[in-house]
């Protein structure tokens, strides 16, 4: 269909770099969530930081082009980086409206296909550009 | 600050492939926008022929995507449209423009092209 | 494709006229309440000009008197007091849908 994607926007504090260039910030009537209309995709993706007792959403927003896991109707996450010991980024790419505003289910830590905690490190910012 | 400007042949022979290139001053292409083509034939509106956006990926019109072609040179901070088996009806006025958004805010000075023999 | 019918073709006015130009769409230019038309100005031999995006956003350094409005399918370009630098062919473009599609036009004649 020709019509273009909106996904949910969100970059948490402290995040380097921004996707927002990837789409056009929506007035959405409310301040959060955010809306975003994608420019260059038909998908949306969202990080979350997963530790010990809670996940986090990190960053939301329009991928940069069309890829394996776009046509996923919804948000399921897989395990992508170590932004510091006992902390997991699990990522996600779908391709319907607003489908990244939350994850499906995410493993719990330490399960079977989540990194070993002994992988590599990353510094906060560098490991969610090594996620997306 | 942001100029785009068009080269290329003015005439092209029908049956022929049209080339086009655009040079971007004041910015580089891999740092964000989109890189379009917009063509208008002689007093009538205008057509978008499709972009190349900042990462490499692109769009075309339906109604060309059998016959145009959108490349870049990020070395020389251009790119290019390429058309095949034109006619006359492809003779126009082509414009390159960059988009930050979806919508036009910076336009070559355009180029007329002429399809004839 | 979405279609953009522009109204009138072409019209003549006198400095200090208000003008409406209007831009109707074959369907719906909307998204989540967003409307993604814009419209542009083109004089003879020159490129267009953007003076408004996103229905009713003027474009930085263009005058006050171009304001837009409209939703969904109907649109509005007014130019609130005719400028001797205003008599030039104005055009809308829908961004709503792929492909991006222009209206065909009206051109603001001195009577």
């Known amino acids: 269909p020709p019509n273009r994607r909106t996904c949910v926007f969100f970059e948490a504090p402290g995040v380097r770099g921004s996707t927002k260039t990837l789409g056009e910030l929506l007035d959405t009537g409310t301040e959060l969530p955010r809306a975003i209309r994608c420019l260059y995709s038909r998908c949306c993706f969202g990080i979350w930081n997963l530790t010990q007792d809670r996940a986090q959403v990190e960053m939301q927003g329009c991928r940069d082009s069309d890829e394996p896991g776009c046509e996923s109707l919804h948000c399921d996450p897989s395990p992508r980086a170590h932004p510091s010991p006992g902390s997991t980024l699990f990522t996600c790419s779908c391709g319907t409206d607003f489908c990244n505003a939350n994850y499906s289910h995410l493993p719990p830590p330490g399960s079977p296909g989540t990194p070993g905690s002994q992988g590599p490190q990353a510094a906060p910012g560098e490991s969610i550009w090594m996620a997306l | 600050q942001l100029q785009l400007q068009e080269s290329g042949p003015g005439l092209v022979k029908p049956s022929e492939t049209l080339s086009l290139t655009c040079t971007v001053s004041?910015?580089?292409?891999?740092?964000?926008?989109?890189w379009n083509w917009i063509r208008q034939p002689p007093g009538k509106g205008l057509e978008w022929m499709g972009y190349i956006s900042f990462s490499g990926s692109t769009s075309y019109n339906p109604s060309l995507k059998s016959r145009v072609t959108i490349s870049r040179d990020t070395s020389k901070n251009q790119f290019s449209l390429k058309l095949s088996s034109v006619t006359a009806a492809d003779t126009a006025v082509y414009y390159c423009?960059?988009?930050?958004?979806?919508?036009?805010?910076?336009w070559g000075q355009g180029t007329l092209v002429t399809v004839s023999s | 494709d979405i279609q953009l019918t522009q109204s009138p073709s072409s019209l003549s006015a006198s400095v200090g006229d208000r003008v409406t130009i209007t831009c109707r769409a074959s369907e719906s230019v909307d998204t989540y309440g967003n409307s993604f038309m814009h419209w542009y100005q083109q004089k003879p031999g020159k490129p267009p000009k953007l003076l408004i995006y996103?229905?009713?956003n003027l474009e930085s350094g263009i005058p006050s008197r171009f304001s837009g409005s409209g939703s969904g399918t109907d649109f509005t370009l007014t130019i609130s007091s005719l400028q001797p630098e205003d008599f030039a062919t104005y055009y809308c473009q829908q961004s709503n849908e792929d492909p991006y599609t222009f209206g065909g036009g009206t051109k603001v004649e001195i009577k």
């Open positions: 996103r229905a009713s």
């Open positions: 423009a960059g988009s930050r958004y979806s919508w036009f805010a910076y």
């Open positions: 004041g910015y580089s292409i891999t740092s964000d926008f989109a």
